[in-house]
Interface confidence: low
């Protein structure tokens, strides 16, 4: 069961569930937000204060790291089987460090399986972070320090920081260095979403987040 | 040396289409963006369209959605600049220019020597 | 969308002047700007980018300055091969270009 479920089954308050993948025994520990948007969004990713590491190798991010509390990567494993089950939307809220709010918002998104590299794949997007897609399209493989599966001649994810779906290297990276503000522009390999910010602004705090598309 | 040599700028009427080509030499096309860039006779630069490497992603000026296709051959280094519903407004010297950038924008940093699109009945 | 905005739109100077070409953008681009060189006839030259980075080949006396919204390019001796029209360009977001300013014998 994902947050959709845990919200329809009366657990309307935002925090930490326990999900578990269909016809598995297999759990993991999510953040639920049930208030935005209609509530029931799993959340996928966060970073908000600097506080965890996503340097990390391609098994962290399979199998996920951090705290779901405050920031963490869910685990592509997880996620690829997910949104594999049924149609899942894909929102990701953004923040600056003036102030300033936006989303943009995938209406299909869905992982591929570790053996095709967790490769993304997003279609329909809406928004306010951007016309353009800031995860370039057609999607590409995950890549991580350890895993270079970018379109580079150089490493993406070792030149940027992160795991991410890395082009060459394209205009995003939510995985990236977190910097503080103040220290926030004229950084390459920060926490990136070109089509809102620009080459060098790094965000202050980002959250990705899925829920069934017939939520 | 990198060369950009532009092709096809013509007299057409309003209305009309014209394809525009960019031959590419001196370095490994299929690994820089590419872009048009055009001027109005006695005017400013204004980018027009870009493509990405692969020609998975094109980007125009609101102006021109809808008119204009931007596409290209790897295997040729070759650059194209596709004009339908042409209008006077779009009478100006066509550039071919590289982008430069290692992510999605960079600095134009070689540009052809352009050709000239007259539109006018 | 980012618009720039050149000034002056002519500047008349003399061989040897120090001159001083403004370029303002409508929002932060944090220094994601650059200065082309364009002669009559021909194609613009990309001179300096990321605000102050002079290009390969280009003469020292050119030279790129500021951030965030705010730039200035820079001759500190003009060479009759100077008196051209130069134009800033933004690609932080998209590229827009700033409409020029043309540097004219006096």
């Known amino acids: 069961r994902d947050c959709a479920e845990v919200f329809k089954s009366g657990h309307t308050t935002n925090g930490v569930y326990t999900l578990t993948l269909p016809n598995s025994t297999e759990e993991v520990k999510a953040y639920c937000d049930m208030e935005a948007g209609g509530g029931g969004w799993t959340i996928i990713q966060r970073r908000e204060d600097g506080s965890v590491d996503f340097q990390r190798t391609w098994k962290e991010y399979k199998v996920g790291f951090g705290n779901p509390s405050g920031e963490y990567w869910l685990g592509n494993e997880f996620v690829s089987q997910l949104t594999n089950q049924q149609r899942y939307v894909l929102k990701i809220h953004l923040k600056d460090w003036e102030g300033n709010e936006a989303y943009s918002l995938y209406e299909h998104f869905y992982l591929s399986s570790e053996e095709l590299n967790y490769r993304i794949h997003l279609k329909g997007l809406t928004g306010t972070a951007g016309k353009i897609s800031s995860i370039s399209q057609p999607g590409n493989d995950f890549s991580t320090k350890d895993a270079d599966n970018d379109k580079c001649i150089c490493k993406c994810s070792q030149m940027l920081t992160g795991g991410w779906w890395f082009d060459a290297c394209g205009p995003s990276n939510l995985n990236g260095m977190y910097y503080p503000q103040r220290q926030n522009t004229n950084k390459f390999n920060g926490i990136k979403w070109y089509y809102w910010k620009g080459s060098g602004y790094s965000l202050k705090g980002t959250t990705m987040m899925i829920r069934p598309a017939d939520f | 040396e990198v060369q950009l040599v532009e092709s096809g700028g013509d007299l057409v009427q309003p209305g009309g289409s014209l394809r525009l080509s960019c031959t590419a030499s001196g370095f490994t096309f299929s690994k820089y963006w590419m872009t048009w860039v055009r001027q109005a006779p006695g005017r400013g630069l204004e980018w027009v369209a870009n493509i990405k490497e692969d020609g998975n992603e094109k980007y125009f000026l609101d102006s021109v959605k809808g008119r204009f296709t931007i596409s290209r051959d790897n295997a040729k280094d070759l650059l194209f600049l596709q004009m339908n519903s042409l209008r006077g407004e779009d009478t100006a010297v066509y550039y071919c220019?590289?982008?430069?950038?290692?992510?999605?924008?960079?600095?134009?940093?070689?540009w052809g020597q352009g050709t000239l699109v007259t539109v006018s009945s | 969308d980012i618009q720039m905005t050149q000034s002056p739109s002519t500047l008349s100077a003399s061989v040897g002047d120090r001159v001083t070409v403004t370029c303002r953008a409508s929002?932060?681009?944090?220094?994601?700007l650059a200065w082309y060189q364009q002669k009559p006839g021909k194609a613009p030259k990309l001179l300096i980018s990321k605000a102050s980075s002079l290009e390969s080949g280009v003469p020292s006396r050119f030279s790129g300055s500021g951030s965030g919204t705010e730039f200035t390019l820079t001759i500190s001796s003009l060479q009759p091969d100077d008196f051209a029209t130069y134009y800033c360009?933004?690609?932080?977001?998209?590229?827009?270009f700033g409409q020029g300013t043309m540097v004219e014998i006096k």
């Open positions: 220019v590289r982008d430069r950038g290692i992510e999605v924008a960079g600095p134009f940093d070689y």
């Open positions: 360009q933004q690609y932080n977001r998209y590229w827009t």
């Open positions: 929002q932060t681009i944090i220094n994601w």
